[in-house]
């Protein structure tokens, strides 16, 4: 069964005299390891002797005998899968068939490999893509069916004999599938490379030439053109003639059509290599080129800029920017078609020449309202002076100017009056569209720029207005100076700092918070009676009779304001004590008698004490002393004592007489 052994190696290996051969090889034997290996050169089987005739280049047997040739030929394999061989150096007569005679425990096998050794290094082979087009990247491949570890080589690319700048990528393969050295060069050919010779040169490690392959580049490209013009500078005046000629310097494949273009647009009925322009006009100024096509595509010449010269045309003014805001910068540009370009300009503002302005542009760094108006210009070149165009309008916008707030009322203004104010301004662009007032209030604006304040408050101090267009301008605030009667009038005790006791020195102050005008008068009143006209009311020694309700008044030219009534309270010890008797000071025994301790005190008496005619205190502490039933023994003089927080007071003696009843008299 011939499938028992499996070998993999290149079918044929190539080399040249003096180089080397590296033969990558793998195998798989039926069973076990390799027992012997013989490498034959051109082995021939002899049927008669059942032996192989041929040179034994290498022998590795069980007994280990090795011929001297083994120095040149090396078996680099192993006993189970690698059968790689090396011959170094390799000779011309090594060409032919190599026979690898291998023996395992149970089988013998002969594997054949072809070796092709040439006298001189054979040339590499250049592979080109089927078509090469200009500016399209292509890969040039140089392939050599050779690689050997013991013999380094290099592949170099040359263009017309000169090394190519582009970096080549060299790769080698020494595998059971293939043995080669390959160099790949990425290259973007230009049309000028058409017909040029590309060489791939095989060199040894020292750069010595060994062999080469050459190819001629066939670079497909669009037609390459040259344009010639008469006159050569392509500058003419209206009415002159111009001739342009198109020459094809290269085309691959041959060209098929010719056309002329002006500013990128094809010229009708111009299909020859010469373009004649007679009596040119300024409209014929522009960029001309010729276009010639082949199967690759159209090729265009460089552009010729034909300049037909003429005097400036009527000018127009462009303003950057209008309307302009006061204080901003503005640029004016004079636009006039002319060839050559204008060299001098004259500028006008509202018809009047602007001195010292001769440039194409006028720059005003800070615009003011008076800069508004019409701007026009005139352009001039070597062929003449143009006409002044219609001009352009500059609108200068600014906030309202000189804004003032005006009080329409007669002065002075009194609290509660209706006040009318107006907001005035001097000028504005654009027009004023609205007004603002400070401070804000629930006020009427009967018409634009007028403010009506009904029932003006005492505390309305200042008002300011703003006139607004795109911006608001504020006026300086105006003072209303509202006049009003004294405010917040009140009575304030200055001394004593604590509660008032009878006999104290007392001062009361009439206070107010504000008054306009400031000049005021004071009035003090108690129970409708005028007491004084100073801001203070003084008592050297207060008495309980001074207690009561006090008011003060403050008035100015606008009106008078009263304080709230203020109660003056005087504290004093119990006084005017007396004992009253009910039903009288003479009472029949057995009846009821009530003694009452009457007094005047502030604060009221908090504690009573009763005494008899012996100044003996009685066990009673209320205001009333009730005797029931009254006895004759109760007859006598009684007095009481009252106490409050200020002090004590006592009454005079009052005598109670208790007389016998008729019954008692009857029993006697």
């Amino acid at each position: 069964d011939s499938s028992k052994w499996v070998f993999e190696h290149p079918e044929t290996l190539y080399a040249w005299e003096g180089a080397c051969v590296w033969i990558p090889c793998t195998y798989r034997a039926l069973d076990g390891d390799l027992e012997s290996f013989i490498l034959f050169h051109n082995p021939e089987y002899n049927k008669n002797t059942s032996k192989f005739d041929g040179t034994r280049l290498y022998e590795s047997t069980k007994d280990g005998k090795v011929p001297s040739e083994q120095k040149r030929v090396q078996f680099l394999g192993d006993k189970n899968k690698n059968c790689t061989l090396s011959i170094h150096p390799v000779h011309l007569n090594d060409s032919g068939q190599l026979g690898l005679r291998m023996e395992s425990k149970t089988e013998k096998w002969m594997e054949r490999i072809h070796l092709n050794v040439s006298e001189r290094p054979f040339p590499p082979h250049i592979q080109l893509p089927p078509e090469i087009q200009e500016s399209q990247e292509v890969t040039l491949t140089c392939l050599l069916n050779f690689s050997c570890y013991g013999y380094p080589i290099q592949l170099q690319w040359l263009l017309e004999g000169v090394p190519m700048r582009q970096a080549a990528v060299t790769s080698t393969s020494l595998t059971i599938k293939s043995v080669f050295t390959r160099s790949e060069l990425k290259f973007s050919p230009q049309w000028s490379h058409h017909g040029k010779i590309v060489t791939c040169q095989l060199q040894d490690a020292d750069g010595k030439f060994l062999s080469n392959d050459t190819v001629q580049l066939n670079v497909k490209h669009t037609p390459k053109l040259e344009i010639k013009v008469t006159p050569s500078d392509a500058i003419v005046r209206e009415g002159d003639s111009v001739t342009m000629t198109c020459e094809v310097s290269s085309s691959n494949p041959e060209y098929t059509t010719v056309s002329w273009l002006k500013d990128g647009t094809s010229l009708k009925k111009q299909n020859t290599f010469t373009l004649n322009l007679r009596e040119v006009t300024k409209d014929q100024s522009g960029k001309y080129c010729c276009q010639v096509s082949n199967d690759v595509g159209p090729g265009r010449s460089e552009e010729v800029f034909l300049q037909v010269q003429y005097a400036p045309e009527p000018s127009t003014v462009q303003i950057l920017h209008s309307p302009a805001v006061e204080g901003s910068q503005v640029e004016f540009l004079c636009m006039s078609l002319a060839n050559p370009l204008p060299t001098n300009y004259t500028w006008y503002h509202n018809g009047k020449e602007m001195q010292g302005r001769t440039e194409e542009k006028v720059h005003i760094p800070k615009i003011l309202p008076w800069h508004a108006g019409t701007y026009s210009c005139v352009a001039e070149n070597i062929l003449g002076t143009g006409q002044r165009g219609p001009g352009a309008e500059l609108d200068v916008q600014y906030p309202p100017k000189k804004v003032t707030t005006v009080i329409q009322n007669p002065m002075p203004i009194r609290e509660g009056d209706t006040v009318t104010l107006s907001c005035n301004y001097n000028s504005s662009n654009p027009s004023v569209t609205r007004y603002e007032w400070k401070p804000h209030g629930a006020w009427e604006e009967p018409s634009l720029g007028v403010l009506k304040i009904q029932n003006v408050g005492w505390d309305n101090t200042t008002i300011a207005c703003a006139a607004c267009n795109s911006w608001c301008s504020w006026a300086s605030p105006v003072a209303l100076n509202v006049q009003y009667a004294p405010r917040d009038v009140r009575v304030r005790k200055i001394k004593p700092l604590s509660e008032i006791h009878s006999g104290n020195s007392v001062s009361l102050q009439c206070d107010f918070s504000s008054s306009h005008p400031k000049e005021v008068q004071f009035f003090w009143e108690k129970n409708g009676r005028l007491l004084g006209k100073e801001s203070q009311l003084n008592f050297d020694s207060i008495s309980p009779e001074d207690a009561g309700s006090y008011s003060c008044w403050v008035n100015n030219s606008i009106g008078q304001t009263a304080s709230k009534a203020w109660t003056l309270e005087v504290l004093y010890a119990p006084r005017r004590l007396r004992v009253s008797m009910s039903p009288g000071d003479q009472v029949m025994e057995g009846k009821s008698a009530t003694l009452t301790c009457e007094s005047d005190a502030n604060p009221p008496v908090s504690h009573y004490t009763w005494f008899d005619w012996n100044n003996q205190s009685l066990p009673y502490h209320s205001q009333k002393l009730r005797l029931e039933p009254v006895k004759v023994q109760h007859s006598g003089a009684y007095w009481c004592q009252g106490t409050n927080s200020v002090g004590k007071g006592r009454s005079p003696l009052s005598t109670l007489t208790v007389y016998y009843s008729p019954e008692t008299i009857g029993r006697r």
Epitope: S2, W5, S50, F52, K105, T106, E107, K108, W109, M110
Partner: nanobody, 128 residues
Framework: QVKLEESGGGLVQPGGSLRLSCTVS????????MGWFRQAPGKEREVVSC????????YYADSVKGRFTISRDNAKNTVYLQMNSLKPDDTAIYYC?????????????????????WGQGTQVTVSS
């Protein structure tokens, strides 16, 4: 180690017959190829007849075709060469060879190739 022992040689008249035997030891006989070689005085050893044990394919040198027959007895590990119509040219020492099968690419050889473990041989003389 292969051990070969040839026997059955002798002197025979032309036209006569001989049967050579070769007993083999030390190998897996079934899969091997076997052959009979001869070497006449002053000549190179040459193939007489071979047989592949695996499939029974045989080979005969042109000079012996139709006269000699190779056979085997696997049970006895023995190879035979039946020689009939012997000629004086058949005179030689006859050697037995038993070897591993040999493949050359797709070819499977019938004879032992590059065999070098020879026995002592057996002399066959054909003479009147």
């Amino acid at each position: 180690q292969v051990k070969l022992e040839e026997s059955g040689g002798g002197l025979v008249q032309p036209g006569g017959s001989l049967r050579l035997s070769c007993t083999v030891s030390g190998v897996t006989f079934d899969y091997y190829v076997m052959g009979w070689f001869r070497q006449a005085p002053g000549k190179e050893r040459e193939v007489v007849s071979c047989m592949r044990n695996s499939d029974g394919v045989t080979y005969y040198a042109d000079s012996v075709k139709g006269r000699f027959t190779i056979s085997r007895d696997n049970a006895k590990n023995t190879v035979y060469l039946q020689m009939n119509s012997l000629k004086p040219d058949d005179t030689a020492i006859y050697y037995c060879a038993v070897d591993k099968p040999f493949y050359d690419g797709g070819n499977y050889y019938t004879c032992p190739v590059d065999f070098d473990s020879w026995g002592q041989g057996t002399q066959v003389t054909v003479s009147s």
